[in-house]
């Protein structure tokens, strides 16, 4: 399966929407900066098959969807932008699910890299813990928004490789 061109466009639109969502200057939140330990190794795409890479991307997008569809998130971000954001994430999840179905039976390796999925979940668990610790303050959400933008940018490299990979 080759991810469609529309998937890359959707990823770019997601980044643009997230950029528009920013309400406060990141400079006013410097004291709240935090290292969430983004699992870069899971997105290098060297150590696993295509189906496994797709499952890792799917997990990241699903967790992002979960994070931004909470009550606390709805109270923080512009509703119109959030709806656009959900639409783009939903589109990407559908693309990846369609791709995963095509990969069934194509490779001998398992469709899921369990370690990688769990690692991505722990990454989002740290983000949720941070928000709770910071009582979902505007600055905490700003730090999280910047972090998710960064993680989407980094995962875009893997998505591009998947789009080109035979």
């Amino acid at each position: 399966c080759d991810l469609p061109q529309t998937h890359s466009l959707s990823n770019r639109r997601t980044l643009m929407i997230m950029a528009q969502m920013g309400r406060i200057s990141p400079f006013s939140c410097l004291k709240d900066r935090h290292d969430f330990g983004f699992p870069q190794e899971e997105f290098d795409g060297n150590q696993f098959q295509k189906a496994q890479a797709i499952s890792v991307l799917h997990e990241m997008i699903q967790q992002t969807f979960n994070l931004f569809s909470t009550k606390d998130s709805s109270a923080t971000w512009d509703e119109t932008l959030l709806d656009k954001f959900y639409t783009e994430l939903y589109q990407q999840l559908n693309d990846l699910e369609a791709c995963m179905m095509q990969e069934v039976g194509v490779e001998d390796t398992p469709l899921m890299n369990v370690d990688s999925i769990l690692t991505v979940r722990k990454y989002f668990q740290r983000i949720t813990l941070y928000l709770t610790e910071k009582k979902y303050s505007p600055c905490a959400w700003e730090v999280v928004r910047a972090e998710i933008m960064r993680s989407f940018s980094l995962s875009a490299n893997l998505q591009e490789r998947l789009r080109r990979k035979e």
Epitope: H34, D35, F36, G37, P39, E41, E42, Q47, F48, Q52, N113, V114, D115, S116, L118, T119, K122, Q125, R126, L129, Y130, E133
Partner: antibody, heavy 122, light 107 residues
């Protein structure tokens, strides 16, 4: 009884290579992440590398990245570390360690081997 | 990387004394801070995980507290067998980092 037994340590010249092994027993090896932690004689502890329960996720300390490679064989309950381009600063006791979870981070190192000494010297 | 700072580097106390060791991290690690004991010539042993969870078989005189960036290991009544080095370690993100250690001696 849960046990971790390291082997493969010894004297090696700078620039040389060495492969350490660790055989696990007494617990379900394939269910836990594993790590290597080292300790230079008379010094503190330094985490070296971790591998997820299925061998899929691998993490390295900046000081060893690109030189060391961690791997595991779940069918033989064995953890490995391949160490290349060794320098004198790699001289240490190397401990094989079981983690409390299936993947690295947000857990603890709850079981340690007795350690194997690696000496890098001319 | 998260820096872990432990203090004091060494201490000497009498049997029965209350002893505290402090550990600070350069950013919040929530509760993901672990404590280890290493007796001379032995491998380390996990005493406390997740800031305050005592491992099975560890005497109840050991306790851990704290969250975020500040943590404390307390030995309520020091015993001769507690003569050892103690290390804290953040398990929040890789690379895992350890404190430099505290050597506890019995007077």
């Amino acid at each position: 009884e849960m046990q971790l037994m390291e082997s493969g340590g010894g004297l090696v010249q700078p620039g040389g290579s060495l492969r350490l092994s660790c055989v696990a027993s007494g617990f379900t090896f394939k269910s836990f992440a594993m790590s290597w932690v080292r300790q230079a004689p008379g010094k503190g502890l330094e985490w070296v590398a971790s591998v997820g329960s299925q061998g899929g996720s691998k993490y390295y300390a900046p000081s060893v990245k690109g030189r060391f490679s961690i791997s595991r064989d779940n069918s033989n309950n064995t953890l490995y570390v391949q160490m290349n381009s060794l320098g004198v600063e790699d001289t240490a006791f190397y401990y094989c360690v079981k983690e409390t979870d299936a993947v690295a981070t947000m857990d603890a190192l709850d079981m340690w081997g007795q350690g194997t000494l690696v000496i890098v010297s001319t | 990387d998260i820096r872990v700072t432990q203090s004091p580097s060494s201490l000497s106390a009498s049997v029965g004394d209350r002893v505290s060791i402090s550990c600070q991290t350069s950013q919040s690690v929530n509760i993901y801070l672990n404590w280890y004991q290493q007796r001379p010539g032995k491998g380390p042993q996990l005493l406390i995980s997740a800031a305050s969870t005592l491992q099975s078989g560890v005497p109840s005189r050991f306790s851990g507290s704290g969250s975020g960036t500040d943590f404390i290991l307390t030995i309520i009544s020091l015993q001769p067998e507690d003569s050892a080095s103690y290390y804290c370690q953040q398990g929040y993100i890789t690379p895992y980092t350890f404190g430099q250690g505290t050597k506890v001696e019995i007077k």
